[in-house]
Each structure stands twice: as C-alpha cells, then as structure tokens.
Interface confidence: low
C-alpha cells in the first residue's frame, strides 16, 4: 500500500485547510489509526490529533475546536483532517503516520502554505501641473503572503518602479507610477492592479488623473471692422483660454476705467451703441490656482462723419 497526499497544501487565510492523507491499499487491509503532527524545525514534532478507527478523533488541547474530520460520508481508509480557520502561524510542515493491518505503518509529510490576500491602497502623488518634469502620479501598496504583484493599467505614458519590504510572515510591495504631466491626461484613469494566488481575481483601484494647466489667452471680436463704427450695436470682445481648474476672467481698460454701459459677462465684454469714447486698450486677465495670463487689444471706434479716419485695429498679447 501507499499514502496519497499532497506535497503542498495551499489555503487562503481564514479558510479551512484540508490536510490529505489517504491510504491506498489492498482490499483486505484496514487502517487502525492516523496520527497527525506538526513538524517544527525548532520545537520538533508536536502532536496535532489522533484519528482512531474505533475510538474516533482525539485532538491536542492546543488545537481544540480547530481540527476536525471532513464531513461524512467518510472512507475508513481516509485519514485526512480539516484545520479550521487557517492563520499564518499554521504555516509549516505536517506529518501523517498511518498504522495499518497487516501492512504496518506509513508516513508522509506535507507543507501547509497560508496565503494572505493583500488589501491594496492607492495614494495619489502631489498635485500635477503642466510644465513639471517627471512627477509621481500615484503609488500603490499591497502586503500579503507570498509577495503580491503590483502593476499599473493605463493608456497614459509613464514609468513604473517597484520595491519590496520583506517582513517575517509577509512582504509589502509598493509600485510608483511617474509621468510628465500634460493637459491631455486630464480625466484619464490610472489603475493599480494587484495579483496574488489568494485572490480569485485581480484587485483593481482606479485613480482619475487631474493635471492643472492654463492656456495662453487671446481676444476675438475685432475681425470685422464694420462693427467698430460709431452707433453700431452688439459689438463684443471675447477672451479665449482654457484651464484646469477652470479659469476666471477679468476685464480692465488700460487707460482708465471701463466706459459706462460696457457689460462684463465672464469671458465676454459687451458694448452699448459705440461712441468714440469706447476707443482704448482693453485687457483680458485670465487666472486659476496655477497661473495667470493677460491679453490686450487696442480698439479704435471709427466715426463715419470723419471720412479721413480709418479704423485702427491693433492686437497684442
């Protein structure tokens, strides 16, 4: 006869570990008892339980309520036991010794491996701003046994670097994702993917990238010369920019206060029926938490009664 067992039994932390020990013998052979022991390199062999064909299961008090036989129906040649609620301290070598009649005794050893599934955490890096060099976007840390694998899933171009810290019964892996911030990365997902044999499927944590930027400002509205004549209505100047966070707009006149009747509505400056008083240098000031930009234009309102005068349009930033 021979013992059927496993070299390695793998179980997830908190689950029940089945320690297999099945005697494969001739039909007339019987199993009298199965002795289970923990084999510790320092403490030697420590009895776990004794499974007797006649007297049933006797468990070492140290393992009371933790060692059981598998649920029925049971094969009389099956000396397997269940170790309930496996913890990391249970990891190690176990031995089953089977006494049979008339073939004698057999023994086998196996290693119990307790997988500790990781609970990953993702930490965003410092605020990202366009114009920075290679910057930490996020770091992801997972600790488990054995060491988990930590990778990144994203369409964003960047670099990944990992480091491990080994503890007595586990290992922590931290992976960092660095990138050169660009406004095109705004709203893009950056996903930390943690793989581990104790997980049924990869754990994923997603961080949405936010990159602060402010585009150059420019002013539109002076393209049609006919609009900028005395008496014309509906003349507007519009300040063009974009940013993250969204920018605020402010309009001023360089050579004095805004004329009466000129309305500021966010990025747009609206004029009442034009007079020569509306000629001047207008400045659009765009700002957000990151930066500020200015664009200025010179408006000259043409008086049709003065045919010698042309509309002079100058735009400068």
């Amino acid at each position: 006869g021979e013992l059927e067992t496993s070299d390695v039994v793998t179980v997830v932390l908190g689950q029940d570990a089945k320690l297999p020990c099945f005697y494969r013998g001739d039909p007339d052979e019987q199993v009298g008892q199965v002795a289970w022991a923990r084999v510790d390199p320092n403490e030697g062999i420590r009895e776990l339980a004794l499974l007797h064909s006649k007297y049933g299961l006797h468990v070492n008090p140290a393992y009371e309520d933790r060692v059981e036989q598998p649920p029925p129906p049971r094969d009389p040649l099956d000396g397997s036991v269940l170790l309930r609620n496996a913890v990391q301290a249970d990891e190690g070598e176990y031995e089953c010794r089977v006494s049979t009649f008339p073939a004698g005794s057999f023994q086998a050893r196996m290693r119990l491996r307790v997988l500790v599934p990781p609970l990953p955490s993702l930490n965003p890096g410092p605020p990202l701003e366009e114009g920075q060099g290679l910057t930490l976007a996020a770091s992801c840390t997972a600790e488990g046994s054995p060491a988990p694998s930590v990778t990144w899933d994203t369409e964003v171009k960047g670099t990944q670097s990992s480091r491990s810290f080994t503890h007595p019964r586990s290992a922590a892996v931290t992976s960092e994702f660095h990138l050169v911030p660009s406004r095109s990365m705004n709203g893009q997902p950056l996903t930390c993917v943690v793989s581990h044999p104790g997980l049924l499927q990869d754990r994923r944590i997603t961080h949405t990238l936010q990159v602060a930027f402010l585009a150059e400002a420019s002013v539109r509205g002076l393209e049609d010369q006919n609009l900028w004549q005395v008496g014309r209505e509906g003349a507007t100047l519009k300040c063009l920019s974009e940013g993250q966070p969204p920018p605020k707009y402010n309009w001023t006149r360089l050579d004095g206060p805004l004329p009466s009747g000129v309305r500021v509505k966010g990025d747009t400056l609206g004029f009442p029926p034009l007079t020569t008083e509306h000629s001047g240098v207008y400045v659009c000031h765009v700002s957000n938490e990151l930066s500020s930009r200015d664009s200025q234009v010179t408006v000259e309102v043409l008086d049709p009664e003065d045919p010698g005068k042309q509309v002079d349009l100058v735009s400068a930033s």
């Epitope: 496993s6 089945k18 044999p197």
Partner: antibody, heavy 116, light 107 residues
Framework: QVQLQQSGPELVKPGASVRISCKAS????????IHWVKQRPGQGLEWIGW????????KYTENFKDKATLTADKSSSTAYMQLSSLTSEDSAVYFC?????????WGQGTTLTVSS | SIVMTQTPKFLLVSAGDRVTITCKAS??????VAWYQQKPGQSPKLLIY???NRDTGVPDRFTGSGFGTDFTFTISSVQAEDLAVYFC?????????FGGGTKLEIK
Amino acid sequence: QVQLQQSGPELVKPGASVRISCKASGYTFTTYYIHWVKQRPGQGLEWIGWIYPGNVNTKYTENFKDKATLTADKSSSTAYMQLSSLTSEDSAVYFCARGLYYFDFWGQGTTLTVSS
Amino acid sequence: SIVMTQTPKFLLVSAGDRVTITCKASQSVNNDVAWYQQKPGQSPKLLIYYASNRDTGVPDRFTGSGFGTDFTFTISSVQAEDLAVYFCQQDYSSPYTFGGGTKLEIK
C-alpha cells in the same frame, strides 16, 4: 483581459514527439497554475497535470507521467507541454487552462492528429 | 482517483424549460466542485465554482448546489444560446476528474 493563446494544429507521425505552447497575457503568469486537459473527439475531459510557473513545480496524473512533460518560460509568460512516443490514442484536442483549483480561463485548444 | 458520475448524458428541452443535471462523486469532495459549459467548437467556460458560486458575468439562471458526494446544476429557464455540453469537475484532490458530460439540445 486574461488570455491564453495556444499554438496551432499539429499533424505528426506515430512514435514522434510534439510540443504545444500556451502564451498567457493579462495577468501575472507566475501566480497561477497552468493546467493541461485532453479531449478526444466527442469525448469528455481528462486532466493531464499542472505546472506552477512561480517555482516550476509540476504534478501529473498517473496516465500521463511517462507521456507528458510540462515546462514554463517566465520571461515569455509561456507554458509548454511536450508529448512523446505518440500513438493514435494521443489524437485529441489539448487545452491549457489557468487556475488555482477550478479553471477560470481556457486556451482555444490545439488539435493534435497522429497519423502515418 | 475520484470518479464523477454525471447524469443524464443527453437532454432535449424547449426554451424556457427548467433543467437539472446531477453529479455524484465516488467519495466526499467537500464542496470542491466546478461546472463548465462547452459550446460546439469552443473551449470550456467556467460557470460555477465551489459547488454554488457563479463566476463573474455568468447569468443568474445558472445555479449549483451540493456538498460531499451529491451535486446539482440547474438552468432555471433554458435559452437557445445554452445549447452546449456541461461538465462537472472535482478539484478536491489530484488527479482532478471530470464527469462524462451532459449534452443539452434545444427542441
């Protein structure tokens, strides 16, 4: 997403050997077992064995101990099964599958025909 | 090795019918049983693991139950796309063994 891409169909002569490949992608190759399963035309499924790429441990069912050899190449995330001394009984579709215990992702299968 | 006896071998049903397939293990396999679906010309697909847990994305008309030696797989309301062969498998101890399969055909 997880994918197992197997090599194409094989036509070999009796007595020869063949090596079938299974390239894994979409997960960490070294943290899951790769199992191999045989299916003869119109028949059921027969487990051959597994390899754990993390430490290259292997386990075979008794019928395949002298027939199949399982290997893995971590650098290319590819598992291989070599079948030797082929006979017509080895003509079948062979699948690789990922799993810890049950098999959650399968390759598309490789058809092996042994014929003179 | 553990023998998984699966019944019936064939099932001819109409769309909307309830279907039950059973698998009996030759010795206790705890709840370490999986069920797979294999459509014509395709590789098997995991439906149920640990006897009663549906895999990700598997419709809830597929259910499994059982413990020890007797296991049941049910399709509560068969759809046309369920035409396939269904296999049980024990992953309690090596060698992992499969049932002989049940071929489901739609009238």
